[in-house]
């Protein structure tokens, strides 16, 4: 396993609809054709997998149908979007990139993007 540098923004604020987008950039040492991207969430020293996708360079990322993540790739960069976030989902979201093929296998883990989620205030009752 060889190490690889991964960069991601430090902080992102989710939208009022619970959507957060961030970029994950990796230094590809060679011409990888198959890349796996995993988003991990770290909160209270617990790490859980949020979503993962494997894609062929030049193609779209394909997450599972029930995934809360979507994404696109461009060169050595992945644009990730996480939906359905609530205040309790605030935490550090870590981008993990693996160059699966061709060998050698490379692994890179970013420092994480702190995503802040604020639940919207409920609308007051109205007579209108």
């Amino acid at each position: 396993c060889k190490a690889m540098h991964v960069a991601q923004p430090a902080v992102v604020l989710a939208s009022s609809r619970g959507i957060a987008s961030f970029v994950c950039e990796y230094a590809s040492p060679g011409k990888a054709t198959e890349v796996r991207v995993t988003v991990l969430r770290q909160a209270d020293s617990q790490v859980t997998e949020v979503c993962a996708a494997t894609y062929m360079m030049g193609n779209e990322l394909t997450f599972l149908d029930d995934s809360i993540c979507t994404g696109t790739s461009s060169g050595n960069q992945v644009n990730l979007t996480i939906q359905g976030l609530r205040a309790m989902d605030t935490g550090l979201y870590i981008c993990k990139v693996e160059l699966m093929y061709p060998p050698p296998y490379y692994l890179g883990i970013g420092n994480g993007t702190q995503i802040y989620v604020i639940d919207p205030e409920p609308c007051p009752d109205s007579d209108f």
């Epitope: 991964v6 960069a7 991601q8 923004p9 970029v23 950039e25 230094a27 060169g75 960069q77």
Partner: nanobody
Framework: EVQLVESGGGLVQPGGSLRLSCAAS????????MGWFRQAPGKEREFVAA????????YYADSVKGRFTISRDNAKNTLYLQMNSLRAEDTAVYYC????????????????????WGQGTLVTVSS
């Protein structure tokens, strides 16, 4: 509005080294690709090197590959260009430039993709 201020230029003998710095004001420095360009007397401004927003990927003109190293310190909002084995043909005014879109993946050497420029710092290589 972000300001870019270059420093570190000067007179150096052939074979010598210099380190240029570009200090950026504002809090969005880490979101943008950055580049170094140069303009020699009587010539067009040309691409020297570029670095991605996260500092992960770097790009060089063939003429400086193996001699120049671009780097950045996002915590200090500063871009660097380490120049070794300098030659007379490296004499020029060196400009730093900020990419036009945050978190871009364009990785371009084209001047049109850079939105902001510093005033430049003069590097003279002569014995």
């Amino acid at each position: 509005e972000v300001q870019l201020v270059e420093s570190g230029g000067g007179l150096v003998q052939p074979g010598g080294s210099l380190r240029l710095s570009c200090a950026a004001s504002g809090r969005t420095f880490s979101s943008y690709d950055m580049g170094w360009f140069r303009q020699a007397p009587g010539k067009e401004r040309e691409f020297v090197a570029a670095i991605s927003w996260g500092g992960v990927n770097t790009y060089y003109a063939d003429s400086v590959k193996g001699r120049f190293t671009i780097s950045r310190d996002n915590a200090k909002n500063t871009l660097y260009l380490q120049m070794n084995s300098l030659r007379a043909e490296d004499t020029a005014v060196y400009y730093c430039a900020r990419g036009s879109a945050p978190y871009s993946s364009s990785r371009s050497s084209a001047q049109e993709t850079y939105a902001q420029w510093g005033q430049g710092t003069l590097v003279t290589v002569s014995s």
